[in-house]
């Protein structure tokens, strides 16, 4: 079978303060079983940006309908961008575990940076 790939097509995303940013992530397989989460940064200090299962992320919405069957689009939108939002964002596939899920594969990351303000 096809091995799962995590596709984040944009290496760099220039955003404007106050606007909404869309971070794209698609997967090539439904397997292995387990969730996709979004993080900013890498390593133990990385920040969880979105987990559909738990947590409260009022500025984050999903691009795809949460009731869509066999979805492979895990893109998100972040509203009301501020300078504190800059950084590199990763979508990460976890393999279902019991009791803990295990990180399986990460996308290559999308760097979010501030672009020039529109004149």
């Amino acid at each position: 079978e096809e091995e799962l790939q995590m596709i984040q097509p944009e290496k760099l995303l220039l955003v404007t303060v106050g606007k909404t940013a869309t971070l794209h992530c698609t997967v090539t397989s439904l397997l292995p079983v387990g969730p996709v989460l979004w993080f900013r940064g890498v390593g133990p200090g990385r920040e969880l940006i979105y987990n559909q299962k738990e947590g409260h992320f009022p500025r984050v919405t999903t691009v795809s309908d949460l009731t869509k069957r066999n979805n492979m689009d895990f893109s998100i939108r972040i509203s009301s961008i501020t300078p504190a939002d800059v950084g590199t964002y990763y979508c990460v596939k976890f393999r279902k575990g019991s009791p803990e899920n295990v990180e399986f594969k990460s996308g290559p990351g999308t760097e979010m940076a501030l672009g020039a303000k529109p004149s």
Epitope: L30, L31, V33, V36, K53, K68, K96, S98
Partner: antibody, heavy 120, light 108 residues
Framework: EVQLLESGGGVVQPGGSLRLSCAAS????????MTWVRQAPGEGLEWVST??????YYADSVKGRFTISRDNSKNTLYLQMNSLRAEDTAVYYC???????????????WGLGTLVTVSS | EIVLTQSPATLSVSPGERATLSCRAS??????LAWYQQKPGQAPRLLIY???IRETGIPARFSGSGSGTEFTLTISSLQSEDFAVYYC??????????FGGGTKVEIK
């Protein structure tokens, strides 16, 4: 049309073994997780085991005794059942998993089931 | 393990009447709940997923509602072919996937 056809059930003595098969057709078998669910006579549904690609999951009641596997080249799901007990007597259904977006799995297609009877 | 409790165990309804089936979860499962119908000697059939989404081909008289810990399956006007056992299943937190004990809808 999705079809799932179980086979391999029968009567076996306590402590014995059986291997169930589920032949799948009508969908891209290798792309989906697959599950075994059982139903004891006159009782409700009980999840047994699920397999993704290499990832496998078991109910506590069968862990260490049952092994789920798949052969994607044959579009076939298997359940190897060892050290069988009287309480394993049930109709065993194979089911295709379907995932809701960012969430978990439910079962959108089921086979007709195969009866396993464990009795001396 | 999340426990699903279905009530009532048996529901006696006349054809054409409304049937309301309940499924209560021991903890929050958000909308990660499915409903199945099973007739004697047959395999279960998916009716509803994501608590409220009707599976393709399922008649509009079947509807699901609720979220969190309280869920309802409603059959607006029972037809003869609807007399069966109905199970709920949660997929929020697994393993294990868990099913309710079932509600038998019988002819009054």
């Amino acid at each position: 049309e999705v079809q799932l056809l179980e086979s391999g059930g029968g009567v076996v003595q306590p402590g014995g073994s059986l291997r169930l098969s589920c032949a799948a057709s009508g969908f891209s078998f290798s792309n989906f997780a697959m599950t075994w669910v059982r139903q004891a006579p006159g009782e409700g549904l009980e999840w047994v085991s699920t397999i993704g690609s290499g990832d496998t999951y078991y109910a506590d009641s069968v862990k260490g005794r049952f092994t789920i596997s798949r052969d994607n080249s044959k579009n076939t799901l298997y359940l190897q059942m060892n050290s069988l007990r009287a309480e394993d007597t049930a109709v065993y259904y194979c089911a295709k998993d379907s995932t809701v977006s960012w969430s978990g799995d439910f079962f959108d297609y089921w086979g007709l089931g195969t009866l396993v009877t464990v009795s001396s | 393990e999340i426990v699903l409790t279905q009530s009532p165990a048996t529901l006696s309804v006349s054809p054409g009447e409304r049937a309301t089936l309940s499924c209560r979860a021991s903890q929050n499962v958000k909308n990660d709940l499915a409903w199945y119908q099973q007739k004697p000697g047959q395999a279960p059939r998916l009716l509803i997923y994501a608590a409220r989404i009707r599976e393709t081909g399922i008649p509009a008289r079947f509807s699901g509602s609720g979220s969190g810990t309280e869920f309802t399956l409603t059959i607006s006007s029972l037809q003869s072919e609807d007399f069966a056992v109905y199970y709920c299943q949660q997929y929020y937190d697994w393993p294990p996937f868990t099913f309710g004990g079932g509600t038998k809808v019988e002819i009054k």
